[in-house]
Amino acid sequence: QPNNSLMLQTSKENHALASSSLCMDEKQITQNYSKVLAEVNTSWPVKMATNAVLCCPPIALRNLIIITWEIILRGQPSCTKAYKKETNETKETNCTDERITWVSRPDQNSDLQIRTVAITHDGYYRCIMVTPDGNFHRGYHLQVLVTPEVTLFQNRNRTAVCKAVAGKPAAHISWIPEGDCATKQEYWSNGTVTVKSTCHWEVHNVSTVTCHVSHLTGNKSLYIELLPVPGAKKSAK
């Protein structure tokens, strides 16, 4: 068992490899055709370590001339994956990440998949479809979400520290009951943020404090019984 005066509880959510997609089935394509074409850009939060499937505009493949996926990742040259229907050829330029691939053969499915999403997959993804009727495109601002590791411990008299380590975006920390708190954020080069909240409770009838961490990947609460003030022996409540 951990010592009450040191770290009491930690949590890191485990996720089985889930898959997320904004793609639509054929029925939806028929119903939403004009709507989807109008929605050119989509912001899309995706949990790290899941699989993601990104879709082109819902255009029948028989009408296609060229499909191009343009991928702009931070600090990297723009990568393009193109498929030309007439010659049935695919071409890649500046694409080094082997986890970003066509879902299947592009002549059968124009969707793009990211296997095991990583922080480095944060960026802008755009599908451009060239047809005799014009060019259609659909873009995704992919925001990779990272679940923070949460810890709660005491470091001195009636003072507790709650940390949400390496979350993306930054987590929000609140306390029950409210204390006299100071919050700091530490930004890491990979885009994650550590939030540290240190609180003190002067009120002596506060027995246990709860740290509540709110995050886009889910919320987590930890609690800890406060240690007695040194020298305090007996009190009536």
């Epitope: 068992q1 009838n205 027995s207 609690y223 022996k233």
Partner: antibody, heavy 114, light 107 residues
Framework: QVQLVQSGSELKKPGASVKLSCKAS????????MHWVKQAPGQGLEWIGN????????NYDEKFQGRATLTVDTSTRTAYMELSSLRSEDSAVYYC???????WGRGTLVTVSS | DVQMTQSPSSLSVSVGDRVTMTCQAS??????LHWFQQKPGKAPKLLIS???NLEDGVPSRFSGSRYGTAFTLTISSLQDEDIATYFC?????????FGQGTKLEIK
């Protein structure tokens, strides 16, 4: 796995005192508050007080202040609750609990009768 | 002291029912709590710690949630062995205080 083993049932006369014990294992005894709770027959639960074995710091509910005495023996990892000037309304099951109320003993039945 | 108001005090139920009970702290005081199950002659058994964390070995039909300063224990589909008294314990403030209990009885 935290275990709290409580002493056996007690039959006492009004005005007497009783001392209950609670022996802990499976956790750092001196690092967690030990609490005592009363449950009278057919009644709800009442918090009596708590003691921090690492320092001997104690809190009592006002209702039990002066009649309940909480102590610990860290060498045997045992917490004690003594209740004095017993009366019939003290007849109840008394529980010790620790780990922020997540681990409970099985309780000790105290019967006060003349 | 923080008073815990638990409702209902008793409930007539049938196997398969969805059962809900609530605890609320006096004056809407923000607190944290545990939920316990108690059967006659037995010590309370912890079901849910910290308002919503299901304890190991507790069936998934039990769940706890927080709505502001109100807390709910839900049994999604009642089983015979769930007939018992349920109570909450707030552990944020001294003195710790308990709900008066919700007793489940078979119709």
């Amino acid at each position: 796995q935290v275990q709290l083993v409580q002493s056996g049932s007690e039959l006492k006369k009004p005005g007497a005192s009783v001392k209950l014990s609670c022996k802990a294992s499976g956790h750092t005894f001196t690092s967690y508050w030990m609490h005592w709770v009363k449950q009278a027959p057919g009644q709800g639960l009442e918090w009596i007080g708590n003691i921090y074995p690492g320092s001997g710091s104690i809190n009592y509910d006002e209702k039990f202040q002066g009649r309940a005495t909480l102590t610990v023996d860290t060498s045997t990892r045992t917490a004690y609750m003594e209740l004095s000037s017993l009366r019939s309304e003290d007849s109840a099951v008394y529980y010790c609990l620790t780990m922020t109320g997540t681990s409970w003993g099985r309780g000790t039945l105290v019967t006060v009768s003349s | 002291d923080v008073q815990m108001t638990q409702s209902p005090s008793s409930l007539s139920v049938s196997v398969g029912d969805r059962v809900t009970m609530t605890c609320q702290a006096s004056q809407g005081t923000p607190i944290n709590l545990h939920w316990f199950q108690q059967k006659p002659g037995k010590a309370p058994k912890l079901l849910i710690s910290g308002a919503s964390n299901l304890e190991d070995g507790v069936p998934s039909r039990f769940s706890g949630s927080r709505y502001g300063t109100a807390f709910t224990l839900t049994i999604s589909s009642l089983q015979d062995e769930d007939i018992a008294t349920y109570f909450c314990l707030q552990f944020t403030y001294i003195p710790w205080t308990f709900g008066q209990g919700t007793k489940l009885e078979i119709k």
